[in-house]
């Protein structure tokens, strides 16, 4: 039963963390104005990962597309890049994780195949988690060096041609967002790897349970489970009694750890 | 089409008060009082989101003048208190457009403060 | 808050001839978001209530005569009437829209000569 909580919890989290991670990286407010001692602004900036937009008192909302590649920072592809890789190994963990589902049956798959699953897509959110939190994290940096640097100068001038007032950005709320996106994706991918120990069929748990007879060698679990004879390669473990009634978690082809506990 | 229809203009005592109305039909986001003292230039006076209820003033009018609105009537308001000499003006209600520009304008109300 | 400085003041002029106001700003209007001023001009007729003319320093409003066109970045600005008519002689108001205080020139009274 803890199992499956765990694994059902585990893709929930992550599937909630890859909608935020999306949601982030499709979000314009990655860094907004900052109104310091102004609360109210007429003229109000904030900018995203493909497009920087301006809102006006007026209720008028202009936005405008980054339609250059090269001539963007290298820091902005580098956070744009982490993004999408994220949310590419997440979708992809997603995949892999529906199909690991223990409540989910898909033909004759075995609990091994399963566990295998199971932990490629917990790497595949922790990865994914980090990739988030590395991309919102290089921006958030950016955004720190720059406010700084717009402090220490708050006029700039292009060429002696245009004078322009420095604004200063800070975080929006695209940051946060992500940061706990990419934390709750993180969280999943643990919580899927942890499962995938309490699917995974490890032979070493009869090793160290089992007494040697003097003439053939027979490994006992606790809860009505027997072992073939010998340490070879057992195809399947017969159960030779039936304990009462069982939940679904219970009714497996191989004995987990969690059986041990 | 925007109309706007400034009303509640008079005579009133130094240190006195009044309410000003502008009642508004069409779309309106936000809203802006500006006056016009006789033979002299332009003065903006405050702004509302006409939605969210935020405001500003210029600071010769905080404290002193307050900018609100009323849904159910569509009205825009300017209460004016502690009257001066100097507010005497004809006052008009715009709305702000692209650009933060004044579009619509209503034909004004003239305040007098005098004795 | 920000000044704004009209010049000049008055200015006479004739039907047909070429007519240029200038706004100069104390801060920039220039917004880096979106690289547009906002600086906006207005024209007032005695008796009434102002007519929008011109946004973002340059954007001329749908309805107004292409005679009228503006230009400037930065803190200077510039409105030009190319060709004088008798309906335009009126007193011309710039406003910076950047920032609150919204903030107005004293105004150009233009005159017939």
């Known amino acids: 039963m803890a199992v499956t909580a765990c694994q059902g919890l585990g893709f929930v989290v992550s599937l909630i963390g890859i909608a935020g991670i999306i949601a982030a990286t499709c979000m314009d407010q990655w860094s907004t104005q900052d109104l310091y001692n102004n609360p109210v602004t007429a003229v109000f900036n904030y900018q995203g990962l493909w497009r920087s937009c301006v809102r006006e008192s007026s209720g008028f909302t202009e936005c405008r597309g980054y339609f250059t590649l090269l001539g963007l920072p290298a820091m902005l592809q580098a956070v744009r890049a982490l993004m999408i890789v994220g949310i590419v190994l997440g979708a992809i963990g997603l995949l892999v994780s529906i199909f690991a589902l223990k409540c989910i049956r898909i033909g004759s798959m075995e609990d091994s195949a399963k566990a295998n699953m199971t932990l490629t897509s917990g790497i595949m959110f922790i990865v994914s988690g980090l990739c988030a939190i590395a991309g919102v994290s290089v921006f958030a940096n950016m955004l720190v060096t720059n406010f700084w640097m717009s402090t220490a100068n708050m006029y700039t001038g292009m060429g002696g041609m245009v004078q322009t007032v420095q604004t200063r950005y800070t975080f929006g709320a695209a940051l946060f967002v992500g940061w706990v996106a990419g934390g709750l994706t993180l969280i999943g991918g643990v919580m899927m790897c942890i499962a995938c120990r309490g699917l995974a069929p490890e032979e070493t748990n009869y090793k160290a349970v089992s007494y040697h007879a003097s003439g053939h060698s027979v490994a006992y679990k606790p809860g009505g489970f027997k072992a073939s004879t010998g340490f070879g390669s057992n195809t399947k473990n017969k159960k030779i009694y039936d304990g009462g009634a069982r939940t679904e978690d219970e009714v497996q082809s191989y004995p987990s750890k969690h059986d041990y506990v | 089409e925007v109309q706007l229809v400034e009303s509640g203009g008079g005579l009133v005592q130094p240190g006195g008060s009044l309410r000003l109305s502008c009642a508004v039909s069409?779309?309106?986001?936000?809203m802006n009082w500006v006056r016009q003292a006789p033979g002299k230039g332009l003065e903006w006076v405050a702004w509302?989101?006409?939605?969210?209820?935020?405001?500003t003033y210029a600071d010769d009018f905080k404290g002193r003048f307050t900018i609100s609105r009323d849904d159910s009537k569509n009205t825009l308001y300017l209460q004016m208190n502690s009257l001066r000499a100097e507010d005497t003006a004809v006052y008009y209600c715009?709305?702000?457009?692209?650009?933060?520009?004044?579009?619509?304008w209503g034909q004004g109300t003239l305040v007098t403060v005098s004795s | 808050d920000i000044q704004m400085t009209q010049s000049p003041s008055s200015l006479s002029a004739s039907v047909g001839d070429r007519v240029t106001i200038t706004c100069k700003s104390s801060?920039?209007?220039?917004?880096?978001?979106?690289?547009?001023?906002?600086l906006t001009w207005y024209q007032q007729k005695p008796g009434k209530a102002p007519k929008l003319l011109i946004y973002?320093?340059?954007t001329l409003v749908s309805g107004v005569p292409s005679r009228f066109s503006g230009s400037g970045s930065g803190t200077d600005y510039t409105l030009t009437i190319s060709s004088l008519q008798p309906e335009d002689f009126a007193t011309y108001y710039c406003?910076?829209?950047?920032?609150?205080?919204?903030?107005f020139g004293q105004g150009t009274k233009v005159e017939i000569k």
């Open positions: 715009a709305r702000l457009y692209n650009g933060n520009s004044l579009d619509y």
């Open positions: 069409g779309y309106t986001f936000s």
């Open positions: 509302i989101n006409m939605y969210t209820g935020e405001k």
């Open positions: 801060q920039s209007l220039l917004n880096s978001g979106n690289w547009k001023s906002y």
């Open positions: 973002w320093a340059s």
């Open positions: 406003q910076n829209a950047y920032s609150f205080p919204f903030t």
